[in-house]
Interface confidence: low
């Protein structure tokens, strides 16, 4: 056996578990799923960009976040065919070093950018619904655009390790070229650090913020309904809140769990070949779940708004946008028939959907 000098657990996993992740159905199923995600994602996100930018004229804070979310998804989706070919070719990389770095960074970038954008969107919803008056000065288009620039920079920063350390290299004596992190077994801090960063910065913190934001929205709306006891309850809002939180959680939790297990394998804490095989087999499947749901996010969030839905269906029927810009609503994205934090005198109306894009 080559490279058998190290005795640090990480190396031994490699020696003891030759079967890990190598199943014929993976080499067929994953490229097929990647292809479906690519087609659906490109189509859906392109329409989202067109609707928000050309039809809705990018006038609200939420529309800025949604547009950026769709753009981040498109950046990732463009590299998906490369990963489909790579998997179909049983993890051989035929595209060269430059594309290896770009494609790897794109995956990492999309994860962080989309999760950060969804987190900001949840904070924006909280401010718009719970503190509409107080937050009006803060929730401006300029703030939204600057926030997006910061998010792109942070996501870019989080993707730097992929650009630096992901490489194509030829494995001697085998005629096989791979695109992977390659490092010495003694220095296993890089992938462990990346894995834990993905867990904490790419999931745990954002999820806690999203959960807190929507919990506070839920409480505020419940309070509003209690004030208007004579009015019928609109449970749709609560279903939407549940759907948003659960959709995010269940999209990412499988990938995050297996990322964490991967870290434990690399640390040598897990030395079980069955688990190594499960992790390596499940990893591309969890990527499919996470990124497919991720690519559906702009549609999912967009369709919560009536105008978005109308323009989207209009676009599908090839009706071009009106040349004249839509009248600018003074309350922008926060438009709500009832705001829990407004004074009670304005609470005679029934609470309307609180997730309008415009």
């Amino acid at each position: 056996i080559l490279n058998s000098s190290t005795e640090d657990g990480i190396k031994r996993i490699q020696d003891d578990c030759p079967k890990a992740g190598r199943h014929n159905y993976i080499f067929v199923m994953i490229p097929t799923l990647y292809s479906i995600i690519f087609v659906v994602g490109i189509f859906g996100n392109s329409l989202v960009v067109i609707v928000i930018y050309f039809y809705m004229k990018l006038k609200t804070v939420a529309s800025v976040f949604l547009l950026n979310l769709a753009l981040a998804d498109l950046c990732f989706l463009l590299t998906l065919p490369l990963w489909a070919v790579y998997t179909a070719m049983e993890y051989r990389w035929p595209f060269g070093n430059y594309l290896c770095k770009i494609a790897s960074a794109s995956v990492s970038f999309n994860l962080y950018a989309s999760v950060f954008l969804l987190t900001c969107l949840s904070i924006d919803r909280y401010l718009a619904i719970v503190h509409p008056m107080k937050s009006r000065l803060r929730r401006t288009m300029l703030v939204a655009k600057v926030t997006c620039i910061i998010i792109w920079l942070l996501a870019g920063l989080a993707s730097l390790p992929a650009i630096i350390h992901r490489n194509v290299f030829f494995i001697e004596n085998t005629n096989i070229t791979v695109c992977a992190f390659h490092y010495e077994s003694q220095n296993s801090t890089l992938p462990i650090g990346l894995g834990l960063t993905k867990n904490i910065l790419g999931f745990l913190f954002p999820f806690l913020i999203i959960l807190t934001s929507y919990t506070l929205i839920w409480k505020a709306l419940k309070k509003a309904y209690e004030i208007q006891k004579n009015k019928p309850r609109n449970d749709d809002i609560f279903k939407i809140i549940m759907a948003i939180v659960l959709f995010f959680f269940f999209s990412w939790i499988p990938h995050q769990i297996f990322t964490f297990l991967d870290v434990l394998i690399q640390l040598g804490i897990i030395r079980d070949c069955r688990i190594a095989d499960i992790v390596d087999t499940a990893m591309p499947i969890t990527i499919c779940i996470a990124y497919f749901n991720n690519c559906l996010n702009p549609l999912f969030y967009g369709f919560l708004g009536k105008k978005f839905k109308r323009y989207f269906l209009q676009l599908l029927k090839y009706i071009p946008p009106k040349a004249k810009s839509h009248s600018n609503l003074s309350t922008k994205m926060s438009t709500l028939s009832y705001r829990p934090s407004d004074n009670v005198s304005s609470s005679t109306k029934k609470p309307a959907p609180c997730f309008e894009v415009e």
């Epitope: 056996i1 080559l2 996993i13 992977a180 296993s188």
Partner: nanobody, 121 residues
Amino acid sequence: QVQLQESGGGLVQAGGSLRLSCAASGSISYYRMGWYRQAPGKEREFVAGIGVGTTTNYADSVKGRFTISRDNAKNTVYLQMNSLKPEDTAVYYCAAYNYFPRSIVYYYVYWGQGTQVTVSS
């Protein structure tokens, strides 16, 4: 650990055919399998490889003449060599190799003892 044993080598005239077999002591289902050769005074070189699925690849010098195949049930890999040339004379080695498709990429290989193939002109 997988032990590999090559067989089927021998002396053959130019233009003739040979079929090499590589029998493994354990399951080869999840290994990439390959054939390599080493001519006297030369470095060991790649001849042909077959993936976990059915992906095959060949050295340019043998393309169209050699065919690699595998029988996972019998834990055996074959190399069908047609239109043999004197320059194909070498010791042919069978190899089983693997690496993780994840962030850790360690490569290792199991080698057979080799079988001599001599092509006379």
